[in-house]
Protein backbone atom coordinates (compact mmCIF):
# COMPACT_ATOMS: atom_id res chain seq x y z
CA UNK A 1 0.00 0.00 0.00
CA UNK A 2 1.11 3.55 -0.80
CA UNK A 3 2.41 5.34 2.29
CA UNK A 4 0.52 8.34 3.61
CA UNK A 5 1.31 11.97 2.75
CA UNK A 6 3.24 13.00 5.85
CA UNK A 7 5.00 16.11 4.47
CA UNK A 8 3.15 19.22 5.64
CA UNK A 9 4.34 21.39 2.69
CA UNK A 10 3.88 20.03 -0.81
CA UNK A 11 4.63 21.53 -4.22
CA UNK A 12 3.05 20.01 -7.32
CA UNK A 13 2.84 20.91 -10.99
CA UNK A 14 -0.46 21.97 -12.57
CA UNK A 15 -2.17 19.55 -14.91
CA UNK A 16 -1.03 16.30 -13.26
CA UNK A 17 -3.06 13.81 -11.21
CA UNK A 18 -2.29 14.24 -7.52
CA UNK A 19 -3.51 12.81 -4.23
CA UNK A 20 -3.34 13.44 -0.49
CA UNK A 21 -3.52 10.42 1.80
CA UNK A 22 -3.99 10.97 5.52
CA UNK A 23 -1.88 9.10 8.07
CA UNK A 24 -4.56 7.48 10.22
CA UNK A 25 -5.84 5.34 7.41
CA UNK A 26 -5.67 2.00 9.25
CA UNK A 27 -7.56 3.59 12.15
CA UNK A 28 -10.24 4.94 9.81
CA UNK A 29 -10.97 1.43 8.53
CA UNK A 30 -11.61 0.26 12.08
CA UNK A 31 -14.20 2.96 12.70
CA UNK A 32 -16.12 2.89 9.44
CA UNK A 33 -19.05 4.74 10.97
CA UNK A 34 -16.93 7.70 12.13
CA UNK A 35 -17.51 10.91 10.17
CA UNK A 36 -14.53 11.76 8.01
CA UNK A 37 -14.25 15.16 6.36
CA UNK A 38 -11.87 16.96 4.03
CA UNK A 39 -11.62 20.76 4.08
CA UNK A 40 -9.83 23.40 2.10
CA UNK A 41 -8.98 26.96 3.08
CA UNK A 42 -7.34 29.53 0.86
CA UNK A 43 -7.05 33.27 1.19
CA UNK A 44 -10.39 34.67 2.33
CA UNK A 45 -12.17 31.32 2.30
CA UNK A 46 -12.17 29.49 5.63
CA UNK A 47 -12.60 25.72 5.86
CA UNK A 48 -14.79 24.81 2.91
CA UNK A 49 -15.75 21.16 3.06
CA UNK A 50 -14.78 19.19 -0.02
CA UNK A 51 -16.94 16.61 -1.75
CA UNK A 52 -17.25 15.31 -5.30
CA UNK A 53 -19.88 18.00 -5.93
CA UNK A 54 -17.29 20.72 -5.11
CA UNK A 55 -15.48 19.97 -8.36
CA UNK A 56 -15.60 17.34 -11.08
CA UNK A 57 -11.81 17.11 -10.67
CA UNK A 58 -12.00 15.93 -7.05
CA UNK A 59 -12.54 12.35 -5.94
CA UNK A 60 -12.78 11.06 -2.36
CA UNK A 61 -11.83 7.51 -1.37
CA UNK A 62 -11.42 5.95 2.08
CA UNK A 63 -8.21 7.72 3.01
CA UNK A 64 -7.45 9.72 -0.10
CA UNK A 65 -8.34 13.01 -1.70
CA UNK A 66 -7.62 12.80 -5.44
CA UNK A 67 -7.27 15.59 -8.00
CA UNK A 68 -7.92 14.81 -11.68
CA UNK A 69 -5.83 16.83 -12.33
CA UNK A 70 -4.56 19.41 -9.84
CA UNK A 71 -4.79 23.03 -11.07
CA UNK A 72 -3.30 26.37 -10.01
CA UNK A 73 -6.44 27.35 -8.09
CA UNK A 74 -6.09 24.25 -5.90
CA UNK A 75 -3.28 26.03 -4.02
CA UNK A 76 -4.16 26.36 -0.35
CA UNK A 77 -4.38 24.52 2.97
CA UNK A 78 -6.08 21.14 3.21
CA UNK A 79 -7.36 19.43 6.33
CA UNK A 80 -8.53 15.94 7.07
CA UNK A 81 -10.70 15.54 10.16
CA UNK A 82 -11.95 12.42 11.89
CA UNK A 83 -13.17 12.53 15.50
CA UNK A 84 -10.31 14.19 17.38
CA UNK A 85 -7.69 13.48 14.66
CA UNK A 86 -6.69 16.30 12.30
CA UNK A 87 -4.04 16.40 9.64
CA UNK A 88 -3.08 19.52 7.71
CA UNK A 89 -1.15 20.09 4.47
CA UNK A 90 -0.14 23.26 2.67
CA UNK A 91 -0.35 22.69 -1.09
CA UNK A 92 1.43 24.91 -3.60
CA UNK A 93 0.53 24.29 -7.24
CA UNK A 94 3.09 25.72 -9.65
CA UNK A 95 2.96 26.45 -13.37
CA UNK A 96 4.08 23.81 -15.81
CA UNK A 97 7.08 24.75 -17.96
CA UNK A 98 5.52 24.75 -21.42
CA UNK A 99 8.95 24.78 -23.11
CA UNK A 100 10.36 21.67 -21.46
CA UNK A 101 9.30 18.12 -20.64
CA UNK A 102 9.78 18.91 -16.94
CA UNK A 103 9.44 21.80 -14.50
CA UNK A 104 12.76 22.85 -12.92
CA UNK A 105 11.25 23.41 -9.46
CA UNK A 106 10.06 19.82 -9.34
CA UNK A 107 13.38 18.07 -9.80
CA UNK A 108 15.08 15.64 -7.42
CA UNK A 109 18.86 15.97 -7.46
CA UNK A 110 21.14 12.95 -7.07
CA UNK A 111 24.93 12.72 -7.05
CA UNK A 112 26.51 9.52 -8.36
CA UNK A 113 30.21 8.69 -8.29
CA UNK A 114 31.76 7.69 -11.59
CA UNK A 115 32.06 3.91 -12.07
CA UNK A 116 29.67 3.35 -9.14
CA UNK A 117 26.30 1.64 -9.62
CA UNK A 118 23.71 4.00 -11.10
CA UNK A 119 20.02 3.17 -11.28
CA UNK A 120 16.84 4.91 -12.37
CA UNK A 121 13.59 3.00 -12.12
CA UNK A 122 10.32 4.53 -13.29
CA UNK A 123 7.68 3.44 -10.79
CA UNK A 124 4.50 4.94 -9.43
CA UNK A 125 2.86 2.54 -7.03
CA UNK A 126 -0.27 4.60 -6.30
CA UNK A 127 -1.37 4.94 -9.94
CA UNK A 128 0.18 1.62 -11.00
CA UNK A 129 -3.09 -0.04 -12.04
CA UNK A 130 -4.12 2.95 -14.18
CA UNK A 131 -0.81 3.44 -15.99
CA UNK A 132 -0.92 2.42 -19.67
CA UNK A 133 2.70 3.08 -20.45
CA UNK A 134 5.76 4.85 -19.09
CA UNK A 135 8.56 6.56 -20.99
CA UNK A 136 11.98 7.63 -19.77
CA UNK A 137 13.55 10.76 -21.23
CA UNK A 138 17.09 12.08 -20.87
CA UNK A 139 17.33 15.84 -21.33
CA UNK A 140 13.85 15.59 -22.90
CA UNK A 141 14.92 13.04 -25.52
CA UNK A 142 13.13 9.71 -25.28
CA UNK A 143 15.33 6.74 -24.40
CA UNK A 144 14.58 3.52 -26.22
CA UNK A 145 14.32 0.94 -23.45
CA UNK A 146 12.78 -2.52 -23.58
CA UNK A 147 10.30 -2.27 -20.71
CA UNK A 148 7.61 0.33 -21.40
CA UNK A 149 5.76 -0.41 -18.17
CA UNK A 150 8.67 0.27 -15.80
CA UNK A 151 11.65 1.58 -17.82
CA UNK A 152 14.90 1.11 -15.91
CA UNK A 153 18.54 2.12 -16.25
CA UNK A 154 21.05 -0.03 -14.35
CA UNK A 155 24.72 0.50 -15.08
CA UNK A 156 28.07 1.69 -13.81
CA UNK A 157 28.00 5.46 -14.05
CA UNK A 158 30.14 7.32 -16.54
CA UNK A 159 30.46 11.08 -16.91
CA UNK A 160 28.30 11.06 -20.05
CA UNK A 161 25.35 9.83 -17.94
CA UNK A 162 24.98 13.26 -16.34
CA UNK A 163 21.68 14.96 -17.14
CA UNK A 164 17.96 15.31 -16.41
CA UNK A 165 16.06 12.01 -16.45
CA UNK A 166 12.27 12.27 -16.62
CA UNK A 167 9.93 9.36 -15.99
CA UNK A 168 6.60 10.12 -17.66
CA UNK A 169 3.67 7.86 -16.73
CA UNK A 170 0.68 7.96 -19.10
CA UNK A 171 -2.68 6.97 -17.60
CA UNK A 172 -6.40 7.06 -18.38
CA UNK A 173 -9.11 8.15 -15.95
CA UNK A 174 -12.76 8.59 -16.85
CA UNK A 175 -11.90 8.58 -20.54
CA UNK A 176 -9.23 11.26 -20.27
CA UNK A 177 -5.48 10.90 -20.76
CA UNK A 178 -3.18 12.24 -18.04
CA UNK A 179 0.53 12.12 -17.44
CA UNK A 180 2.68 12.29 -14.31
CA UNK A 181 6.31 13.38 -14.57
CA UNK A 182 9.09 12.66 -12.09
CA UNK A 183 12.48 14.18 -12.96
CA UNK A 184 15.93 13.46 -11.51
CA UNK A 185 18.92 15.73 -12.02
CA UNK A 186 21.84 13.29 -12.07
CA UNK A 187 25.29 14.74 -11.46
CA UNK A 188 28.26 12.42 -11.99
CA UNK A 189 31.26 13.19 -9.81
CA UNK A 190 34.69 11.69 -9.43
CA UNK A 191 35.36 8.86 -7.02
CA UNK A 192 35.38 10.81 -3.77
CA UNK A 193 36.89 7.96 -1.83
CA UNK A 194 40.36 8.36 -3.36
CA UNK A 195 43.07 10.18 -1.43
CA UNK A 196 46.32 11.72 -2.56
CA UNK A 197 48.89 9.14 -1.38
CA UNK A 198 51.26 10.44 1.26
CA UNK A 199 54.80 9.24 1.95
CA UNK A 200 55.38 9.43 5.68
CA UNK A 201 58.44 11.20 7.07
CA UNK A 202 60.97 13.59 5.54
CA UNK A 203 61.61 13.68 1.80
CA UNK A 204 65.39 13.40 2.23
CA UNK A 205 66.93 11.07 4.81
CA UNK A 206 70.63 10.68 5.62
CA UNK A 207 71.22 7.36 7.34
CA UNK A 208 74.39 6.85 9.39
CA UNK A 209 75.92 3.41 8.74
CA UNK A 210 79.07 1.38 9.32
CA UNK A 211 80.84 -0.51 6.55
CA UNK A 212 80.27 -4.26 6.69
CA UNK A 213 77.03 -3.88 8.68
CA UNK A 214 73.40 -4.18 7.52
CA UNK A 215 70.72 -1.49 7.33
CA UNK A 216 66.95 -1.55 6.79
CA UNK A 217 65.43 1.47 5.05
CA UNK A 218 61.73 1.68 5.82
CA UNK A 219 59.40 3.47 3.41
CA UNK A 220 55.86 3.99 4.64
CA UNK A 221 52.87 5.58 2.95
CA UNK A 222 49.17 6.15 3.34
CA UNK A 223 47.59 5.20 0.03
CA UNK A 224 44.65 3.82 -1.95
CA UNK A 225 44.15 0.13 -2.63
CA UNK A 226 45.35 0.41 -6.26
CA UNK A 227 48.41 2.59 -5.55
CA UNK A 228 51.90 1.11 -5.75
CA UNK A 229 55.00 1.65 -3.64
CA UNK A 230 58.45 0.64 -4.85
CA UNK A 231 62.18 1.22 -4.47
CA UNK A 232 64.48 2.53 -7.19
CA UNK A 233 68.25 2.40 -6.87
CA UNK A 234 71.31 2.12 -9.10
CA UNK A 235 71.27 1.77 -12.85
CA UNK A 236 69.22 -1.39 -12.81
CA UNK A 237 67.33 -2.59 -9.74
CA UNK A 238 68.53 -5.98 -8.56
CA UNK A 239 72.08 -5.68 -9.90
CA UNK A 240 73.49 -5.60 -6.35
CA UNK A 241 73.14 -9.04 -4.66
CA UNK A 242 73.40 -7.36 -1.22
CA UNK A 243 70.24 -5.29 -1.74
CA UNK A 244 66.86 -6.90 -1.09
CA UNK A 245 63.35 -5.47 -1.34
CA UNK A 246 61.26 -7.05 1.42
CA UNK A 247 57.63 -7.99 0.97
CA UNK A 248 55.29 -5.05 1.29
CA UNK A 249 53.15 -4.93 4.42
CA UNK A 250 49.67 -3.42 4.20
CA UNK A 251 47.21 -2.62 6.97
CA UNK A 252 43.77 -1.20 6.30
CA UNK A 253 42.93 2.01 8.16
CA UNK A 254 39.51 2.58 9.77
CA UNK A 255 38.72 4.95 6.88
CA UNK A 256 39.20 2.16 4.34
CA UNK A 257 42.57 3.40 3.09
CA UNK A 258 45.85 1.51 3.37
CA UNK A 259 48.99 2.00 5.44
CA UNK A 260 51.76 0.42 3.39
CA UNK A 261 55.35 -0.24 4.39
CA UNK A 262 58.17 -1.52 2.18
CA UNK A 263 61.66 -2.16 3.51
CA UNK A 264 64.87 -2.09 1.48
CA UNK A 265 67.48 -4.24 3.19
CA UNK A 266 71.14 -3.56 2.41
CA UNK A 267 73.53 -6.21 3.70
CA UNK A 268 77.28 -5.95 4.17
CA UNK A 269 77.37 -2.24 3.34
CA UNK A 270 80.28 -1.33 1.05
CA UNK A 271 81.77 1.92 -0.26
CA UNK A 272 79.58 1.60 -3.37
CA UNK A 273 76.45 1.92 -1.22
CA UNK A 274 77.50 5.27 0.28
CA UNK A 275 76.38 8.67 -0.97
CA UNK A 276 74.00 7.26 -3.58
CA UNK A 277 70.23 7.81 -3.74
CA UNK A 278 67.86 5.03 -2.71
CA UNK A 279 64.46 6.32 -3.85
CA UNK A 280 61.12 5.12 -2.57
CA UNK A 281 58.22 6.07 -4.86
CA UNK A 282 54.49 5.90 -4.38
CA UNK A 283 52.51 6.05 -7.62
CA UNK A 284 48.81 6.60 -8.12
CA UNK A 285 46.51 7.83 -10.85
CA UNK A 286 47.27 11.29 -9.47
CA UNK A 287 50.99 11.03 -10.09
CA UNK A 288 54.08 10.10 -8.13
CA UNK A 289 55.79 11.16 -4.93
CA UNK A 290 59.31 10.16 -3.93
CA UNK A 291 61.41 10.16 -0.79
CA UNK A 292 65.16 9.56 -0.85
CA UNK A 293 67.64 7.87 1.46
CA UNK A 294 71.41 8.44 1.39
CA UNK A 295 73.76 6.20 3.36
CA UNK A 296 76.52 8.15 5.12
CA UNK A 297 79.50 6.68 6.96
CA UNK A 298 79.19 7.28 10.70
CA UNK A 299 82.63 8.91 10.78
CA UNK A 300 81.36 11.56 8.32
CA UNK A 301 78.32 12.47 10.42
CA UNK A 302 79.90 15.64 11.80
CA UNK A 303 79.77 17.24 8.35
CA UNK A 304 75.95 17.09 8.13
CA UNK A 305 73.47 19.10 10.26
CA UNK A 306 71.84 16.94 12.92
CA UNK A 307 68.23 17.48 11.83
CA UNK A 308 68.65 15.54 8.56
CA UNK A 309 69.55 12.24 10.20
CA UNK A 310 67.32 9.19 10.35
CA UNK A 311 68.46 6.69 12.94
Amino acid sequence: AESCTSRPHITVVEGEPFYLKHCSCSLAHEIETTTKSWYKSSGSQEHVELNPRSSSRIALHDCVLEFWPVELNDTGSYFFQMKNYTQKWKLNVIRRNKHSCFTERQVTSKIVEVKKFFQITCENSYYQTLVNSTSLYKNCKKLLLENNKNPTIKKNAEFEDQGYYSCVHFLHHNGKLFNITKTFNITIVEDRSNIVPVLLGPKLNHVAVELGKNVRLNCSALLNEEDVIYWMFGEENGSDPNIHEEKEMRIMTPEGKWHASKVLRIENIGESNLNVLYNCTVASTGGTDTKSFILVRKADMADIPGHVFTR
Epitope: F159, V228, G286, G287, D289
Partner: antibody, heavy 115, light 113 residues
Framework: QVQLVQSGTEVRKPGASVKVSCKAS????????ISWVRQAPGQGLEWMGW????????DYALKLQDRVTMTTDTSTNTAYMELRSLRSDDTAVYYC????????WGRGTLVTVSS | DIVLTQSPDSLAVSLGERATINCRSS????????????LAWYQHKPGQPPKLLIY???TRESGVPDRFSGSGSGTDFTLTISSLQAEDVAVYYC?????????FGQGTKLEIK
Protein backbone atom coordinates in the same frame (compact mmCIF):
# COMPACT_ATOMS: atom_id res chain seq x y z
CA GLN B 1 31.64 18.08 -19.47
CA VAL B 2 34.85 16.20 -18.69
CA GLN B 3 37.42 17.03 -21.33
CA LEU B 4 41.02 17.91 -22.19
CA VAL B 5 41.32 20.69 -24.77
CA GLN B 6 44.67 21.04 -26.51
CA SER B 7 46.24 23.98 -28.32
CA GLY B 8 46.38 24.11 -32.12
CA THR B 9 48.77 22.93 -34.82
CA GLU B 10 52.39 24.16 -34.61
CA VAL B 11 55.10 24.40 -37.26
CA ARG B 12 58.71 24.83 -36.12
CA LYS B 13 62.19 24.85 -37.61
CA PRO B 14 64.81 22.36 -36.40
CA GLY B 15 66.51 23.57 -33.20
CA ALA B 16 63.47 25.59 -32.10
CA SER B 17 61.13 24.88 -29.18
CA VAL B 18 57.41 24.22 -28.96
CA LYS B 19 55.03 24.48 -26.01
CA VAL B 20 51.72 22.60 -26.19
CA SER B 21 48.91 23.30 -23.73
CA CYS B 22 46.17 21.02 -22.41
CA LYS B 23 43.27 22.59 -20.51
CA ALA B 24 41.26 20.28 -18.26
CA SER B 25 37.63 20.81 -17.30
CA UNK B 26 34.82 18.90 -15.63
CA UNK B 27 36.90 17.19 -12.95
CA UNK B 28 39.23 18.00 -10.04
CA UNK B 29 42.47 18.77 -11.84
CA UNK B 30 44.75 17.90 -8.92
CA UNK B 31 43.27 14.41 -8.53
CA UNK B 32 44.94 13.08 -11.68
CA UNK B 33 48.35 13.20 -13.27
CA ILE B 34 48.67 14.33 -16.88
CA SER B 35 50.65 12.14 -19.26
CA TRP B 36 51.93 13.20 -22.65
CA VAL B 37 51.92 10.65 -25.48
CA ARG B 38 53.06 11.22 -29.06
CA GLN B 39 52.65 9.43 -32.36
CA ALA B 40 55.02 10.10 -35.24
CA PRO B 41 53.73 9.44 -38.77
CA GLY B 42 53.47 5.69 -39.38
CA GLN B 43 54.73 4.92 -35.88
CA GLY B 44 53.15 3.62 -32.67
CA LEU B 45 52.28 5.43 -29.43
CA GLU B 46 55.19 6.71 -27.34
CA TRP B 47 54.82 7.74 -23.69
CA MET B 48 56.84 10.92 -23.15
CA GLY B 49 56.34 11.44 -19.43
CA TRP B 50 53.87 12.73 -16.91
CA UNK B 51 53.34 15.33 -14.25
CA UNK B 52 51.52 14.97 -10.93
CA UNK B 53 48.99 17.78 -10.84
CA UNK B 54 48.87 17.70 -7.03
CA UNK B 55 52.60 18.24 -6.38
CA UNK B 56 54.23 19.06 -9.73
CA UNK B 57 56.49 15.97 -9.66
CA UNK B 58 57.57 14.85 -13.11
CA ASP B 59 58.76 11.61 -14.62
CA TYR B 60 60.15 11.71 -18.16
CA ALA B 61 61.03 9.03 -20.70
CA LEU B 62 64.82 8.64 -20.64
CA LYS B 63 65.35 9.52 -24.32
CA LEU B 64 63.55 12.87 -23.90
CA GLN B 65 64.44 13.94 -20.38
CA ASP B 66 67.13 16.47 -21.38
CA ARG B 67 64.78 18.19 -23.89
CA VAL B 68 61.32 18.06 -22.34
CA THR B 69 59.68 20.03 -19.52
CA MET B 70 56.18 19.38 -18.23
CA THR B 71 54.42 21.93 -16.04
CA THR B 72 50.95 22.64 -14.71
CA ASP B 73 49.06 25.78 -13.76
CA THR B 74 46.48 24.77 -11.17
CA SER B 75 44.85 28.22 -11.28
CA THR B 76 43.75 27.58 -14.87
CA ASN B 77 43.67 23.74 -14.74
CA THR B 78 46.16 23.62 -17.59
CA ALA B 79 49.11 21.31 -18.27
CA TYR B 80 51.98 22.27 -20.57
CA MET B 81 54.59 20.25 -22.43
CA GLU B 82 57.63 22.06 -23.82
CA LEU B 83 60.01 20.27 -26.17
CA ARG B 84 63.30 21.96 -27.01
CA SER B 85 65.99 21.48 -29.68
CA LEU B 86 63.42 20.12 -32.09
CA ARG B 87 64.45 17.63 -34.76
CA SER B 88 62.60 16.42 -37.81
CA ASP B 89 61.81 13.11 -36.07
CA ASP B 90 59.87 15.07 -33.41
CA THR B 91 57.19 15.64 -36.06
CA ALA B 92 54.18 13.94 -34.50
CA VAL B 93 50.72 14.30 -33.04
CA TYR B 94 51.11 15.10 -29.33
CA TYR B 95 48.35 14.00 -26.97
CA CYS B 96 47.72 14.79 -23.34
CA UNK B 97 45.93 12.09 -21.36
CA UNK B 98 44.63 11.81 -17.81
CA UNK B 99 45.83 9.43 -15.11
CA UNK B 100 48.05 6.38 -15.43
CA UNK B 101 45.70 4.44 -17.64
CA UNK B 102 44.16 6.86 -20.07
CA UNK B 103 40.36 6.99 -20.07
CA UNK B 104 40.45 10.65 -21.12
CA TRP B 105 42.50 12.08 -24.00
CA GLY B 106 42.92 15.43 -25.68
CA ARG B 107 42.19 15.59 -29.43
CA GLY B 108 45.90 15.88 -30.20
CA THR B 109 48.19 18.67 -31.42
CA LEU B 110 50.12 18.24 -34.66
CA VAL B 111 53.68 19.54 -34.39
CA THR B 112 55.61 19.68 -37.66
CA VAL B 113 59.37 20.22 -37.57
CA SER B 114 60.68 21.21 -40.97
CA SER B 115 63.33 23.50 -42.37
CA ASP C 1 62.21 -0.12 -18.71
CA ILE C 2 59.39 -2.61 -19.12
CA VAL C 3 59.17 -3.70 -22.76
CA LEU C 4 55.78 -4.81 -24.15
CA THR C 5 55.78 -7.01 -27.24
CA GLN C 6 52.51 -7.50 -29.13
CA SER C 7 51.72 -10.32 -31.49
CA PRO C 8 50.84 -10.47 -34.28
CA ASP C 9 51.87 -7.14 -35.84
CA SER C 10 48.84 -7.33 -38.10
CA LEU C 11 45.76 -9.49 -38.19
CA ALA C 12 42.97 -10.06 -40.73
CA VAL C 13 39.74 -11.59 -39.42
CA SER C 14 36.35 -12.18 -41.08
CA LEU C 15 33.31 -10.25 -39.85
CA GLY C 16 31.64 -12.07 -36.97
CA GLU C 17 34.77 -14.11 -36.22
CA ARG C 18 36.96 -13.97 -33.11
CA ALA C 19 40.08 -11.78 -33.05
CA THR C 20 42.85 -12.36 -30.53
CA ILE C 21 45.80 -10.06 -29.82
CA ASN C 22 48.60 -10.95 -27.40
CA CYS C 23 50.85 -8.76 -25.30
CA ARG C 24 53.94 -10.02 -23.48
CA SER C 25 55.73 -7.97 -20.83
CA SER C 26 59.49 -8.17 -20.18
CA UNK C 27 58.70 -8.28 -16.46
CA UNK C 28 55.63 -8.98 -14.38
CA UNK C 29 53.10 -6.16 -14.04
CA UNK C 30 51.20 -8.04 -11.32
CA UNK C 31 51.40 -6.21 -8.00
CA UNK C 32 51.26 -8.83 -5.27
CA UNK C 33 50.03 -6.41 -2.58
CA UNK C 34 46.64 -6.00 -4.25
CA UNK C 35 46.73 -8.74 -6.91
CA UNK C 36 46.13 -6.25 -9.72
CA UNK C 37 47.71 -6.34 -13.16
CA UNK C 38 48.74 -2.84 -14.23
CA LEU C 39 47.94 -3.27 -17.92
CA ALA C 40 45.52 -1.48 -20.26
CA TRP C 41 44.33 -1.95 -23.85
CA TYR C 42 43.50 0.83 -26.34
CA GLN C 43 41.85 1.08 -29.75
CA HIS C 44 43.29 3.72 -32.09
CA LYS C 45 41.62 4.88 -35.29
CA PRO C 46 43.16 7.40 -37.72
CA GLY C 47 42.46 11.05 -36.90
CA GLN C 48 41.14 10.25 -33.42
CA PRO C 49 42.75 9.98 -30.00
CA PRO C 50 43.16 6.41 -28.71
CA LYS C 51 40.21 4.95 -26.82
CA LEU C 52 40.58 3.01 -23.57
CA LEU C 53 38.99 -0.43 -23.82
CA ILE C 54 40.34 -2.40 -20.85
CA TYR C 55 42.24 -1.56 -17.66
CA UNK C 56 43.54 -3.72 -14.79
CA UNK C 57 44.04 -6.28 -17.60
CA UNK C 58 40.40 -7.40 -17.57
CA THR C 59 38.10 -4.54 -16.47
CA ARG C 60 36.06 -3.22 -19.38
CA GLU C 61 35.80 0.58 -19.55
CA SER C 62 32.25 1.98 -19.33
CA GLY C 63 30.55 2.16 -22.70
CA VAL C 64 32.84 -0.40 -24.35
CA PRO C 65 30.86 -3.21 -26.05
CA ASP C 66 31.00 -6.53 -24.24
CA ARG C 67 32.49 -8.26 -27.28
CA PHE C 68 35.80 -6.80 -26.06
CA SER C 69 37.44 -8.69 -23.20
CA GLY C 70 40.87 -8.79 -21.59
CA SER C 71 42.59 -11.66 -19.82
CA GLY C 72 45.97 -12.78 -18.53
CA SER C 73 48.22 -12.11 -15.56
CA GLY C 74 51.84 -11.41 -14.77
CA THR C 75 53.61 -11.19 -18.12
CA ASP C 76 51.15 -12.62 -20.69
CA PHE C 77 47.94 -10.84 -21.68
CA THR C 78 45.27 -11.20 -24.35
CA LEU C 79 42.68 -8.87 -25.88
CA THR C 80 39.79 -10.77 -27.45
CA ILE C 81 37.07 -9.44 -29.74
CA SER C 82 34.47 -12.21 -29.70
CA SER C 83 32.64 -11.25 -32.90
CA LEU C 84 34.41 -8.77 -35.16
CA GLN C 85 32.37 -5.80 -36.40
CA ALA C 86 33.31 -3.45 -39.24
CA GLU C 87 33.86 -0.57 -36.80
CA ASP C 88 36.54 -2.58 -34.94
CA VAL C 89 39.08 -1.99 -37.70
CA ALA C 90 41.88 -0.08 -35.92
CA VAL C 91 45.32 -0.40 -34.36
CA TYR C 92 45.28 -1.92 -30.87
CA TYR C 93 47.88 -1.17 -28.19
CA CYS C 94 48.64 -2.60 -24.78
CA UNK C 95 50.18 -0.30 -22.14
CA UNK C 96 51.68 -0.99 -18.72
CA UNK C 97 51.30 1.48 -15.86
CA UNK C 98 53.19 -0.56 -13.27
CA UNK C 99 56.44 1.40 -13.47
CA UNK C 100 57.47 4.58 -15.23
CA UNK C 101 58.13 4.94 -18.08
CA UNK C 102 54.57 3.79 -18.80
CA UNK C 103 55.36 1.96 -22.02
CA PHE C 104 53.13 0.87 -24.92
CA GLY C 105 53.36 -2.20 -27.10
CA GLN C 106 54.27 -1.59 -30.75
CA GLY C 107 50.64 -2.00 -31.85
CA THR C 108 48.61 -4.60 -33.77
CA LYS C 109 46.78 -3.58 -36.93
CA LEU C 110 43.39 -5.31 -37.19
CA GLU C 111 41.75 -5.57 -40.60
CA ILE C 112 38.77 -7.39 -42.09
CA LYS C 113 39.47 -10.47 -44.17
Amino acid sequence: QVQLVQSGTEVRKPGASVKVSCKASGYTFTSYGISWVRQAPGQGLEWMGWISAYNGNTDYALKLQDRVTMTTDTSTNTAYMELRSLRSDDTAVYYCARGWYFALWGRGTLVTVSS
Amino acid sequence: DIVLTQSPDSLAVSLGERATINCRSSQSVLYSSNNRNYLAWYQHKPGQPPKLLIYWASTRESGVPDRFSGSGSGTDFTLTISSLQAEDVAVYYCQQFYRTPYTFGQGTKLEIK
